[in-house]
Interface confidence: medium
């Protein structure tokens, strides 16, 4: 059903990183516009991105209200310039998105090494606790605030002079590793949620090496 000059949206896809969440779809509109609605399983539909010619809609503000809820979105198609027009069934064409549970599915953003500090044969590597758009009491929560102990970081480190990598894991944002005295090391970290079935790992952080700006070195 639907009007003769509109086509239903298709390929509805959730794109979400650290809870910044955008719904994308096709096709690029020709003589039509779109409106998006989002709802939890038990909630009412809320309209967003009214009569847009875009093929994406930022739904972050809705999903961050409760990242453990499961959300469903739908995209309505309307004839351009005649948005009151409906299909033969009495409502505009629409297509449903897949269900989306942000806590289980949002991609983990690329982490950043905040600092590293060498004290003798130990190096303390600190991962930046990235801010998300999830709020509590008017404060933006960090990734660690949201995921708690479900989130770990994996550190990859190696001597600048060789390619053999070692790994360490932490469920805080800090690593304390043993290094050989007098050697320079390079570091990269990855955020991981081990118990997820999808989107378990982030991409690796940019590599940081000792002897460059970011670190501090103290010989004991």
């Amino acid at each position: 059903s639907g009007t003769t000059n509109t086509v239903a949206a298709y390929n509805l896809t959730w794109k979400s990183t650290n809870f910044k969440t955008i719904l994308e779809w096709e096709p690029k509109p020709v003589n039509q516009v779109y409106t998006v609605q989002i709802s939890t399983k038990s909630g009412d539909w809320k309209s967003k991105c009214f009569y847009t010619t875009d093929t994406e809609c930022d739904l972050t503000d809705e999903i961050v209200k409760d990242v453990k809820q499961t959300y469903l979105a739908r995209v309505f198609s309307y004839p351009a310039g005649n948005v009151e027009s409906t299909g033969s069934a009495g409502e505009p064409l629409y297509e449903n998105s897949p269900e989306f549970t942000p806590y289980l599915e949002t991609n983990l953003g690329q982490p950043t090494i905040q600092s590293f500090e060498q004290v003798g044969t130990k190096v303390n590597v600190t991962v930046e606790d990235e801010r998300t758009l999830v709020r509590r009491n008017n404060t933006f929560l960090s990734l660690r605030d949201v995921f708690g102990k479900d989130l770990i970081y994996t550190l990859y480190y190696w001597k600048s002079s060789s390619s053999g990598k070692k790994t360490a894991k932490t469920n805080t944002n800090e690593f304390l590793i043993d290094v050989d005295k007098g050697e320079n090391y390079c570091f990269s970290v990855q955020a991981v949620i081990p118990s997820r079935t999808v989107n378990r790992k982030s991409t690796d952080s940019p590599v940081e090496c000792m002897g460059q700006e970011k670190g501090e070195f103290r010989e004991i």
Epitope: S42, Y103, K149, D150, N171, P194, S195
Partner: antibody, heavy 118, light 107 residues
Framework: EVQLVQSGAEVKKPGASVKVSCKAS????????MNWVRQAPGQGLEWMGE????????TYNQKFKARVTMTVDQSTSTVYMELSSLRSEDTAVYYC???????????WGQGTTVTVSS | SIVMTQSPDSLAVSLGERATINCKAS??????IAWYQQKPGQSPKLLIY???NRYTGVPDRFSGSGYGTDFTLTISSLQAEDVAVYYC?????????FGGGTKVEIK
């Protein structure tokens, strides 16, 4: 297939200790927290604590903190729960349970009956 | 710690009829609620997590709803194999706590 296999039934005297094991298989052992939950005869479920098999770090219910110790042996994918200074009210079935992402317990061991009797 | 109060303590429902179990938290737990089924002599089995998400392999006659402090588990059409004790559990704030259980029987 995920499996949690617990050690057999134990009968203990008041004041003694008991150590219950839970051997995991069929998944990445270090990727999931392991919890211990007990159930007294005819009663409900009571959470005792959890252990991170990757680090060995544990969090205990305040009620049991002075008497419970949870440990891990990564080489055998086994977690242990030791409860000391046993009393008759510790008679219960003790379960290990794997904590899924976000908190719920998705897989449970078959349970170990511990009877405390003089 | 958060206290979970289940009602009723027991429930007798005819085969094919709807069974409804309630769970109330002493403070808001958002949607951090799980529901478990325990049959006699067996370990508990996870049915619902995040208040309304069915766990893998759970029949769709089981559904969960609620948010904040009040939650419901519904069995839309009771089957003989559903006879069990059902527990709610909050996984919002440690220590994780369970309701006292609701025994579901056939009328």
């Amino acid at each position: 297939e995920v499996q949690l296999v617990q050690s057999g039934a134990e009968v203990k005297k008041p004041g003694a200790s008991v150590k219950v094991s839970c051997k995991a298989s069929g998944y990445s052992f270090t990727g999931y927290y392991m919890n211990w939950v007990r159930q007294a005869p005819g009663q409900g479920l009571e959470w005792m604590g959890e252990i991170n098999p990757s680090t060995g770090g544990s969090t205990y219910n305040q009620k049991f903190k002075a008497r419970v110790t949870m440990t891990v042996d990564q080489s055998t994918s086994t977690v242990y729960m030791e409860l000391s200074s046993l009393r008759s009210e510790d008679t219960a079935v003790y379960y290990c349970a794997r904590r899924e992402l976000g908190g719920p317990f998705g897989y449970w061991g078959q349970g170990t009956t511990v009877t405390v009797s003089s | 710690s958060i206290v979970m109060t289940q009602s009723p303590d027991s429930l007798a429902v005819s085969l094919g009829e709807r069974a409804t179990i309630n769970c109330k938290a002493s403070q808001s737990v958002s949607n951090g609620i799980a529901w478990y089924q325990q049959k006699p002599g067996q370990s508990p089995k996870l049915l619902i997590y995040f208040a309304s998400n069915r766990y893998t392999g759970v029949p769709d006659r089981f559904s969960g709803s609620g948010y904040g402090t009040d939650f419901t588990l519904t069995i839309s059409s009771l089957q003989a194999e559903d006879v069990a004790v059902y527990y709610c559990q909050q996984d919002y704030s440690s220590p994780w706590t369970f309701g006292g259980g609701t025994k579901v029987e056939i009328k």
